[in-house]
């Protein structure tokens, strides 16, 4: 289980993407969750500079909402995953070509660390909004 806490996003990279005042999940498996997750996004965003103008905004939104998941506050703070349909829209519609390239690089082990893998969600493992409309976060 993820252990962490809910807090308002105070970073810069995802400022324009994440909903204002929304709570995000900060994962305490990192020594400094805010800094680590921000670095994760920052690293991935740098690679997005080369993608198409159609793909980029969709990929940025997916990235930010995946690394800084919406957080449901409670006694046990709970990260809410992105809906599968939004992930698939980015993968198969807006960023089809780029996604193939990225997956190819991943299979060939061209990424230096697991950072990039962490930043890309596996769409098939995400909950569908058709199962339960409240079971996932919409972009």
């Amino acid at each position: 289980d993820n252990k962490g806490y809910c807090a308002q996003y105070r970073g810069e990279v995802c400022n324009a993407v994440l909903a204002k005042d929304a709570l995000v999940f900060l994962n305490t498996s990192y020594a400094d969750p805010e800094e680590a997750q921000e670095l994760l996004v920052h690293t991935a965003w740098n690679e997005l500079k080369v993608v198409s103008p159609v793909c980029r905004p969709a990929a940025e939104a997916l990235l930010c909402n995946h690394i800084f998941q919406e957080c449901s506050p409670g006694v046990v703070p709970t990260p809410i995953p992105i809906c599968r349909e939004y992930c698939l829209a980015v993968k198969e519609l807006f960023c089809a070509k780029e996604w193939l390239v990225m997956e190819e690089k991943t299979h060939r082990g061209l990424y230096r660390s697991e950072m990039h893998l962490l930043s890309v969600p596996e769409c098939s493992k995400l909950p569908s909004m058709h199962w339960d409309p409240t079971a996932c976060a919409r972009l």
Epitope: S72, P73, V75, D132, A135, C136
Partner: antibody, heavy 124, light 107 residues
Framework: EVQLVESGGGLVKPGGSLRLSCAAS????????MNWVRQAPGKGLEWVSS????????YYTDSVKGRFTISRDNAKNSLYLQMNSLSAEDTAVYYC?????????????????WGQGTLVTVSS | DIQMTQSPSTLSASVGDRVTITCRAS??????LAWYQQKPGKAPKLLIY???SLESGVPSRFSGSGSGTEFTLTISSLQPDDFATYYC?????????FGQGTKVEIK
């Protein structure tokens, strides 16, 4: 049927201690976070403390930090509140309350079941 | 701590009236707000969570709305059983806090 029954309340002198208990039945106690909420006579509600199902997460309101300790025994389906250094401001009905997540499993639903409360009176 | 302010403190109404209670938060709590009903000598009862989600078993005449800092609880047609005190509660961040309560009494 979900039941929460508080006990352990009573009259105590300022500076004294008291241990409240809450006996739970009708649900899988070990799967739920639990809470204490109090209400001073004629006043509003005040959240006191919360504990997660496995006791990994524990929270207190500022006014009781260092004086109150929340704990649970899942084997006995029981929630506890150890109250030390009590003052007149702690006089209240203390409610044990359960919470849950909605059917999606993600969205928190606070205080969906309550006990009948136990009265704690701090007076010399 | 986030302060919750309810208005009015007391509300006089008749059976069949549409009643609205307002709850304001001192800072944004997005939708993390609950409403409770309490009758004298009884424990509170959860009515609404996540600002607008109706708790199971609660009559549909109760509804919640709002987001950010301003929220409302509406009783579409007041019934004799609805005369009670109502509390809002934020659970956006610890410490969780309640409003001071709104007493709905018979006019």
């Amino acid at each position: 049927e979900v039941q929460l029954v508080e006990s352990g309340g009573g009259l105590v002198k300022p500076g004294g201690s008291l241990r409240l208990s809450c006996a739970a039945s009708g649900f899988t106690f070990s799967s739920y976070s639990m809470n204490w909420v109090r209400q001073a006579p004629g006043k509003g509600l005040e959240w006191v403390s919360s504990i997660s199902s496995s006791s990994s997460y524990i929270y207190y309101t500022d006014s009781v930090k260092g004086r109150f300790t929340i704990s649970r025994d899942n084997a006995k389906n029981s929630l506890y509140l150890q109250m030390n250094s009590l003052s007149a401001e702690d006089t209240a009905v203390y409610y044990c309350a359960r919470d849950r997540y909605d059917r999606s499993g993600y969205y928190y639903v606070p205080f969906d079941q309550w006990g009948q409360g136990t009265l704690v009176t701090v007076s010399s | 701590d986030i302060q919750m302010t309810q208005s009015p403190s007391t509300l006089s109404a008749s059976v069949g009236d549409r009643v609205t209670i307002t709850c304001r938060a001192s800072q944004s709590i997005t939708s993390w707000l609950a409403w409770y009903q309490q009758k004298p000598g009884k424990a509170p009862k959860l009515l609404i969570y996540k600002a607008s989600s109706l708790e199971s078993g609660v009559p549909s005449r109760f509804s919640g709305s709002g987001s950010g800092t301003e929220f409302t609880l509406t009783i579409s047609s007041l019934q004799p059983d609805d005369f009670a005190t109502y509390y809002c509660q934020q659970y956006n961040s610890f410490s969780w806090t309640f409003g001071q309560g709104t007493k709905v009494e018979i006019k």
